[in-house]
């Protein structure tokens, strides 16, 4: 009779995480008498997975009844597979011996590969805000996937980005992998409502990629533009001076009026109007009584936006000239009403 062969018919078994793996093994003969054991790995450091003779292996079940005398099917099932179970499994026949059984013949091995889904991509932007025309970096990370093959794309408002670098770690064989990508994005003044999306496609996702997003509203700072204008009011000796603060983001803004360099009043932007692009407008005004002034008055609107150095715009109020002839007749927005009489 031919010598016993241990047949492992599958070079590979591919299983999704959480599922059950079936590792097939048959023997071609009942002789010699002795148990079968399953190991992960080969050599002295191999790990015992199942021993027909003894031991407790809660995740392992046998496909056939190994207690039957004529059984030659030694296939096993391993439940609740995780990426850590990946490796090469050997079905090994032992010959009954005294005091210990002796290894007789091993199968060729079956490589268990585990498909594991990537975690939801996490996108993070720069720690500090940046202004339009600046380039900022976004990172995207996803972990725990297998196999290694993965595709990552970046989008800004649905348009694919090309300036990014991606690494999948580790470089060599591993039970699971991580991906890290850094994309460079040039900010524009219209980006308050913009989104940056990191999209990850993997064989486990069956064509339904995972997405992580970052809102550029968390990243962008649009500095305001200032315009100081003067309009006459009903009383001949009063002038309304307005400071229009336009197109700023975020809302955090403090305005200070200076008269000839001296602080007159400080206020915080509260009732703002929002533009379509997500930026804000705000207006502050002073009611100036010019009759008490012999000299010209230099009015300065100074704005500190989002903790940045202050920007300012000045306006010279000519006391000698007729107030009705001065300034541009800009329509005031009723977003604030602040009076200041100069005596």
């Amino acid at each position: 009779e031919e010598e016993l062969q241990v047949i492992q018919p599958d070079k590979s078994v591919l299983v999704a995480a959480g599922e059950t793996a079936t590792l097939r093994c048959t023997a071609t003969s009942l002789i010699p008498v002795g148990p079968i054991q399953w190991f992960r790995g080969a050599g002295p450091g191999r790990e015992l997975i199942y021993n027909q003779k003894e031991g407790h292996f809660p995740r392992v079940t046998t496909v056939s009844d190994l207690t039957k005398r004529n059984n030659m099917d030694f296939s096993i099932r391993i439940g609740n597979i995780t990426p850590a179970d990946a490796g090469t499994y050997y079905c090994v026949k032992f010959r009954k011996g005294s005091p210990d059984d002796v290894e007789f013949k091993s199968g060729a091995g079956t490589e268990l590969s585990v498909r594991a889904k990537p975690s939801a991509p996490v996108v993070s932007g720069p720690a500090a805000r940046a202004t339009p025309q600046h380039t900022v970096s976004f990172t995207c990370e996803s972990h725990g996937f297998s196999p290694r093959d993965i595709t990552l794309k970046w989008f800004k408002n649905g348009n694919e980005l090309s300036d990014f670098q991606t690494n999948v770690d580790p470089v060599g064989e591993s039970v699971s992998y991580s991906i890290h990508s850094t994309a460079k994005v040039v900010l524009t003044r219209e980006d308050v409502h913009s989104q940056v999306i990191c999209e990850v496609a993997h064989v486990t996702l069956q064509g339904d990629p995972l997405r992580g997003t970052a809102n550029l509203s968390e990243t962008i700072r649009v500095p305001p533009t200032l315009e100081v204008t003067q309009q006459p009011v009903r009383a001949e000796n009063q002038v309304n001076v307005t400071c229009q603060v336009r197109k700023f983001y975020p809302q955090r803004l403090q305005l200070t009026w200076l008269e000839n360099g001296n602080v007159s009043r400080t206020e915080t932007a509260s009732t703002v109007t929002e533009n379509k692009d997500g930026t804000y407008n705000w207006m502050s005004w002073l009611l100036v009584n010019v009759s008490a002034h012999r000299d010209d008055v230099k009015l300065t609107c100074q704005v500190e936006h989002d903790g940045q150095p202050a920007v300012s715009k000045s306006h010279d109020l000519k006391v000698s000239a007729h107030p009705k002839e001065q300034g541009s007749n800009t329509a005031a927005e009723n977003t604030g009403s602040n009076e200041r009489n100069i005596y």
Epitope: K11, S12, T88, G107, A108, G109, E111
Partner: antibody, heavy 118, light 108 residues
Framework: DVQLVESGGGVVRPGESLRLSCAAS????????MSWVRQGPGEGLEWVAG????????WYADSVKGRFTISRDNSKNTLYLRLFSLRTEDTAIYYC???????????WGLGTLVTVSS | EIVLTQSPGTLSLSPGETATLSCRAS??????LAWYQQKPGQAPRLLIY???SRATGIPDRFSGSGSGTDFTLTISSLQSEDFAVYYC??????????FGGGTKVEIK
């Protein structure tokens, strides 16, 4: 479309070595076991070697055991066969073949010719 | 090693006739048998797997049957493009994977 393109064949003397490559495209390479099958001039098909998804398990025909080495690089979607100590009887067209789930071959390359001659 | 024996070595038939090809295994291979077609200068093409399942894109005039040790490939109503060499292959029994010696179907 699945494509397998072999390269690296040529004329060598007995005892010399060669490395064959098979570039795969149109499918997830790391999801398939792969094999090399050869066909001598005017002869039938002979399976040479096979490899598991990640290269942990390799199978060889007795006729090439110890002389040929199969390997793969999943990052490059490429299968390799190193041929050492070549003999005249190794002269054949070497086909790269994709294995389906039960080790039959559902896609084949066009082959690369290896000629061992003194 | 499982040996596959194909017969006949050559089959001479006319277009429209039915070809019956045989493949016998030296051991029980259950239903783990595939059939391939090879035309001159071309790579083999999978026709049948698991003894009787047609591969994608294979016309239904090709059919496979059998299990254990005796298998048959039948080509009904031969077309001109069917004249080729046909090989059987056993699998699912570990290494080595083996092929039969082939049957040439030629025009009579």
């Amino acid at each position: 479309d699945v494509q397998l393109v072999e390269s690296g064949g040529g004329v060598v003397r007995p005892g010399e070595s060669l490395r064959l490559s098979c570039a795969a495209s149109g499918f997830t390479f790391s999801d398939h076991d792969m094999s090399w099958v050869r066909q001598g001039p005017g002869e039938g098909l002979e399976w040479v070697a096979g490899i598991s998804l990640r290269g942990g398990v390799t199978w060889y025909a007795d006729s090439v055991k110890g002389r040929f080495t199969i390997s793969r690089d999943n990052s490059k979607n490429t299968l390799y066969l190193r041929l050492f100590s070549l003999r005249t009887e190794d002269t054949a067209i070497y086909y790269c073949a994709r294995e389906s789930w039960n080790t039959f071959f559902d896609y084949w390359g066009l082959g690369t010719l290896v000629t061992v001659s003194s | 090693e499982i040996v596959l024996t194909q017969s006949p070595g050559t089959l001479s038939l006319s277009p429209g006739e039915t070809a019956t090809l045989s493949c016998r295994a030296s051991q029980n291979v259950r239903s783990n048998l595939a059939w391939y077609q090879q035309k001159p200068g071309q790579a083999p093409r999978l026709l049948i797997y698991d003894a009787s399942s047609r591969a994608t894109g294979i016309p239904d005039r090709f059919s496979g049957s059998g299990s254990g040790t005796d298998f048959t490939l039948t080509i009904s109503s031969l077309q001109s493009e069917d004249f080729a060499v046909y090989y059987c292959q056993q699998y699912g029994n570990g290494p080595p994977l083996t092929f039969g010696g082939g049957t040439k179907v030629e025009i009579k």
